[in-house]
Every structure is written in structure tokens, then in C-alpha cells.
């Protein structure tokens, strides 16, 4: 039975040209996290394997940095980066947990961080 929950940074906004940290946290389970994947819509941005480390997709290596922790840093943001991002936790024995973050990249300097929320 999957008892865990993923807490994410939720709906967030950031300025064009700036950077943003995408963060997820898995709680309420004793399952072993074996790998975390970060995805944007249908594209795999990065893999963080618990034993074998971080691997950034060649398509994103210039604008994506690992961490902090299991999070992901997006740099040199453009308006095209607006959209849904997913953290996918592969765990044993529970299986897969998925968290969703919506990022809006703004032209102006009024970007504010959204509230944190939970996805069961």
C-alpha cells in the first residue's frame, strides 16, 4: 500500500532570464527512494539515481543544474519554460510517486512564489 505523499513548491513564477529551484519532498513512507526523475511535459530533464548520481539530459545540460538535494535548478529562464514540471520518485517497495509543479515565467519583475501544497 502506498502511504507516502509528495510535497512540492506548487505553482510558482519567476522572471525571464532568472533561475528557479524546483523542489519536491516525499514523506509519510519508509520506502527506499531509488531514483528521482525530473520531467517537463513529455521530456526527461534529469535523473538522480540514489547510488549512481545525477545525469542531465544533453538537451538541457546548459540550463539545468542538479540540486539542491533532490531538487533541480533551472537557469536562464525563457517564456517557453512556462508549463508543468514533474518530480517522479521511484521507490521500493511502494512504486512510483509523482509531484507536479507549475512554473510561469514572467516578462515583468513582479514574479512571486506560490504556496506549497501536497499531492497524495
Amino acid at each position: 500500500m502506498m502511504t507516502g505523499t509528495i510535497e512540492t513548491t506548487g505553482n510558482i513564477s519567476a522572471e525571464k532570464g532568472g533561475s528557479i529551484i524546483l523542489q519536491c519532498h516525499l514523506s509519510s513512507t519508509t520506502a527506499q527512494v531509488t531514483q528521482v526523475n525530473w520531467e517537463q511535459q513529455d521530456q526527461l530533464l534529469a535523473i538522480c539515481n540514489a547510488d549512481l548520481g545525477w545525469h542531465i539530459s544533453p538537451s538541457f545540460k546548459d540550463r539545468v543544474a542538479p540540486g539542491p538535494g533532490l531538487g533541480l535548478t533551472l537557469q536562464s529562464l525563457t517564456v517557453n519554460d512556462t508549463g508543468e514540471y514533474f518530480c517522479i520518485y521511484h521507490t521500493y517497495p511502494d512504486g512510483t510517486y509523482t509531484g507536479r509543479i507549475f512554473l510561469e515565467v514572467l516578462e515583468s519583475s513582479v514574479a512571486e512564489h506560490g504556496a506549497r501544497f501536497q499531492i497524495p
Epitope: 531509488t34 531514483q35 526523475n37 520531467e39 513529455d42 521530456q43 526527461l44 535523473i47 539515481n49 540514489a50 547510488d51 549512481l52 548520481g53 545525469h55 539530459s57 544533453p58 521511484h90 521500493y92 512510483t96
Partner: antibody
Framework: EVQLVESGGGLVQPGGSLRLSCAAS????????MSWVRQAPGKGLELVAT????????YYPDSVKGRFTISRDNSKNTLYLQMNSLRAEDTAVYYC????????????WGQGTLVTVSS | DIQMTQSPSSLSASVGDRVTITCKAS??????VSWYQQKPGKAPKLLIY???TRHTGVPSRFSGSGSGTDYTLTISSLQPEDFATYYC?????????FGGGTKVEIK
């Protein structure tokens, strides 16, 4: 030059134990996660264990979980695989392997050591 | 676990032929795929990672492509040293699993 040299294979009876070693050189061993991959005679490849750089995290597929233990001694630049309760289906060549720097694939492999489980 | 199904399991080809090997994943693995070459009695050699990136020193006749569940390794002009067995591997989820292999033999 990266070098991985396995040893410790041999013939063992079903239910027996064996410990494999992999001596690493040519890179900073303590900075890399490591893996063991096996290949049964005439068959494909199977990843059987992984360990992080400091030995604090390990992973095993269900096929060997509870029977195999991966460990490392960073002071000796050596990776180990302790295999207990061995079965005939564990007969294989066992390779230690390391991912390439910045490559999502096993770029470095040892020559392999053969483990035969038979009565 | 994700199953990686390679086809064909073996093929016969001549030097200079264009050879295509396919690997089908049991679920979307989003380009987290690598390819290896193995010769008898030797360890595998990494050819391609992230579905299409050639590893250092790999000849340009080897190329990889694909997305979703379907991936391809192509040898544009088969050379005598290319007769070997080829394996795909997925890294999308643990355990990282391999395909069953494709043996490329001399016609």
C-alpha cells in the same frame, strides 16, 4: 587509465557462499558509485547491485535481494559482492562496472569473473 | 520492472550493409537509453547514451535514435570489427534493465 579487475570467482555448491572483489585504479574511487552486472552463459546482462560513493546506500533487484550484499572499502579502492545462498541460476560471469563521467551508461567494465554454482 | 525487447535476436549481414537494431520498452523511458557492443569473451563496450549521444571514441557509423517506447541503433556501413552482440539498456527506472541482445553475424 581506468582499470577494474575482478577476482574471487569459482565453483561453489548450491546454498554456498562466495565473495567477489573488484580492484579499481586510474580514478578517484571514493567519488563514484559502482555496480555489479552479471551475464549467465549465452544470455543477456543483468544489473545485480549498486552502491553509492561512500557505501551508505545500496540497491538490489528482487532476484538477489536478501542474498547478495555489495560493499566497498575506499581506503583499498576495492568493491565487493558477498553472495550467499547461491543457486544454479546465479551461474554467470560477474562484472564490476562504473558509469562514465557525465554519461548515462556504463563506460568502464572489468574483465569479469566466472561464478559456477553446481553440485 | 521495465522490459526491453530487442529485435531481431540475430541477423546476418555483409560488410558495407546498413544494419538497424530496435529496442522496445514496456513503457515510455523518455530517451534514457544506452547501447552496448559485446564481443565473445569480452566485457560490453558503451556505444550510445541518452538514446542518441555517441560515447567518446565511438565511430560515426554508429547512431542512435528514438523516443517514447521505441529506440533504434543503426550501423550505417557495417565493418568487419562490428560483428558482435548489441544490447540496449534503460535508465528511466530502477532496476536499470537490459534488452536480450541482438547478434550480428557475417552473411
Amino acid at each position: 587509465e581506468v582499470q577494474l579487475v575482478e577476482s574471487g570467482g569459482g565453483l561453489v555448491q548450491p546454498g554456498g557462499s562466495l565473495r567477489l572483489s573488484c580492484a579499481a585504479s586510474g580514478f578517484t574511487f571514493s567519488s563514484y558509485g559502482m555496480s555489479w552486472v552479471r551475464q549467465a552463459p549465452g544470455k543477456g546482462l543483468e544489473l545485480v547491485a549498486t552502491i553509492n560513493s561512500n557505501g551508505g546506500s545500496t540497491y538490489y533487484p528482487d532476484s538477489v535481494k536478501g542474498r547478495f550484499t555489495i560493499s566497498r572499502d575506499n581506503s583499498k579502492n576495492t568493491l565487493y559482492l558477498q553472495m550467499n545462498s547461491l543457486r544454479a541460476e546465479d551461474t554467470a560471469v560477474y562484472y564490476c562496472a562504473r558509469l562514465g563521467t557525465g554519461t548515462l551508461g556504463f563506460a568502464y567494465w572489468g574483465q569479469g569473473t566466472l561464478v559456477t554454482v553446481s553440485s | 520492472d521495465i522490459q526491453m525487447t530487442q529485435s531481431p535476436s540475430s541477423l546476418s549481414a555483409s560488410v558495407g550493409d546498413r544494419v538497424t537494431i530496435t529496442c522496445k520498452a514496456s513503457q515510455d523511458v523518455k530517451t534514457a537509453v544506452s547501447w552496448y557492443q559485446q564481443k565473445p569473451g569480452k566485457a560490453p563496450k558503451l556505444l550510445i547514451y541518452w538514446a542518441s549521444t555517441r560515447h567518446t571514441g565511438v565511430p560515426s557509423r554508429f547512431s542512435g535514435s528514438g523516443s517514447g517506447t521505441d529506440y533504434t541503433l543503426t550501423i550505417s556501413s557495417l565493418q568487419p570489427e562490428d560483428f558482435a552482440t548489441y544490447y540496449c539498456q534503460q535508465h528511466y527506472s530502477t532496476p536499470w534493465t537490459f534488452g536480450g541482445g541482438t547478434k550480428v553475424e557475417i552473411k
